[in-house]
């Protein structure tokens, strides 16, 4: 997260880290005791999932292995449309005040809505500085029409933009798959942005979760 702040401890109990060994690979969001939602471009063969801590690599955090993941069938490695994936944990998480599932959206929030994005991604760009603490940034949803002025045909129909005019605050490497939460519901998953990160008026681009609720529910049901 560029130009963000340290999240209030315990304020994001649904935030998970997908680790490759001990190294941060992507963020993710707990949606059920067996399931984590993340970005399709974060796919690996297997995952070590850290839950219940704001510190990356926290020894006291829950760590659960995951060997199955389900990319959206319409994900394109070329255009990155449908950048959404469900990761099935090998064992259920122990829910607590530190580990909770996020609320999935009932509706799509409108442009102008205030949201918070979080992650352990680099806080500087192009040179990287990975924080140990979970970082947050407060952003607002941007209309597709406005966002297309910047990204033109790169912006797919189910992509959502967020940012703050003239501000550097944004997501970056390592934040991928992490949550954009608006009015206590999951509205976005970090998908992509321009580089170096934090260029003012280049919004962060997210997968618009409200458009995928049916796919999420059906996939979890099919692979119970």
């Amino acid at each position: 997260i560029i130009d963000g702040y340290k999240c209030k401890e315990g304020s994001h109990p649904w935030q998970v880290a997908l680790l490759k060994g001990n190294q941060l690979h992507c963020g993710g969001v707990l949606v059920d005791k067996y399931w984590v939602l993340t970005a399709a471009h974060c796919k690996m063969g297997q995952y070590q999932v850290q839950l219940g801590s704001d510190k990356i690599g926290d020894q006291s955090a829950q760590k659960i292995k995951a060997t199955k993941s389900f990319r959206h069938p319409g994900y394109s490695t070329k255009t990155h449309v449908n950048d959404i994936m469900l990761v099935r944990l090998d064992e259920p998480v122990k829910m607590s005040s530190k580990v909770e599932a996020v609320q999935l959206p009932e509706h799509c929030e409108p442009p102008g809505t205030s949201c918070t994005v979080s992650g352990w991604g680099t806080t500087t760009s192009p040179d990287v500085t990975f924080p140990s603490d979970l970082m947050c940034s407060d952003v607002k949803l941007i209309s597709s029409r406005e966002c297309k002025k910047v990204y033109k045909d790169l912006l797919g129909k189910t992509m959502l933009c967020a940012g703050i005019p003239d501000s550097k605050t944004n997501t970056c490497n390592g934040d991928s798959g992490g949550p954009l939460v608006c009015n206590d519901t999951l509205q976005g998953l970090v998908s992509w942005g321009t580089y170096p990160c934090g260029q003012p008026n280049d919004p962060g681009v997210y997968t618009q979760v409200c458009k995928y609720k049916r796919w999420v529910m059906e996939t979890m049901k099919t692979h119970r």
């Epitope: 490759k20 970005a39 399709a40 471009h41 490695t77 070329k78 255009t79 990155h80 950048d83 760009s125 192009p126 040179d127 990287v128 033109k152 045909d153 790169l154 997501t171 970056c172 490497n173 934040d175 991928s176 970090v190 998908s191 992509w192 942005g193 321009t194 580089y195 990160c197 681009v205």
Partner: antibody, heavy 127, light 108 residues
């Protein structure tokens, strides 16, 4: 300031393996923000991408050369290398190493432009 | 594979001229196109990335435009040091990364 320097034999016999090394100075090869790239240019011709490698040692090769190419990275020496097997006269070229700087992050991290280049090394395939 | 076609393959121009080079992709590559300049015996140099963004240290007389399949590199007022070969390059996902055939800008 980051600099790249290619090294290796200037003359290789047909059917042998061409081996080149690119040494990175003024910066670390261990940055997950960059790709490390090999490109070649036959005499009087245009540029041809050979392949790339990232910090995680994931490799990406030109389909036309894939069966003969190996790119590897040695983070301890701050170097990356190219091996091209079963060479013929058609592999005679100036070989460049370069840094691929991503144009995006996240899902768009794969898109990049080469912003730092070595000066190139001439390799002739001849008996 | 996506083919990149540059035109013209060569052109003659005078100092102070406005020069336009075009690059066409065989299918849409959004704005993932870069332009390079190469002088004889030297390595290429990145001029423009993401179709229209000027690389740091490159003079503002260079500009790029286009999206989808058609792209343009413009030199607003040609300078003596601009006589070189220019290449476009697409990078819309691996593999392969491909270059255009090049445009040689010569002195008239």
């Amino acid at each position: 300031q980051l600099q790249l320097q290619e090294s290796g034999p200037g003359l290789v016999k047909p059917s042998e393996t061409l081996s080149l090394t690119c040494t990175v100075s003024g910066g670390s090869i261990s940055s997950d923000d960059y790709y490390w790239v090999w490109i070649r240019q036959p005499p009087g011709k245009g540029l041809e991408w050979i392949g790339s490698i990232d910090y995680y040692a994931s490799t990406y090769y030109s389909p036309s050369l894939k069966s003969r190419v190996t790119i590897s990275v040695d983070t301890s020496k701050n170097q990356f290398s190219l091996k091209l097997s079963s060479v013929t006269a058609a592999d005679t070229a100036v070989y460049y190493c370069a840094r691929g700087r991503p144009l995006g992050y996240g899902a768009k991290h794969y898109y990049y432009g080469m912003d730092v280049w070595g000066q190139g090394t001439t390799v002739t395939v001849s008996s | 594979d996506i083919q990149m076609t540059q035109s013209p393959s060569s052109l003659s121009a005078s100092v102070g001229d406005r020069v336009t080079i075009t690059c066409r992709a065989s299918q849409s590559i959004s704005s993932y196109l870069n332009w390079y300049q190469q002088k004889p015996g030297k390595a290429p140099k990145l001029l423009i990335y993401s179709a229209s963004s000027l690389q740091s240290g490159v003079p503002s007389r260079f500009s790029g435009s286009g999206s989808g399949t058609d792209f343009t590199l413009t030199i607003s007022s040609l300078q003596p040091e601009d006589f070189a070969t220019y290449y476009c390059q697409q990078s819309p996902y691996f593999p392969p990364l491909t270059f255009g055939g090049g445009t040689k800008v010569e002195i008239k």
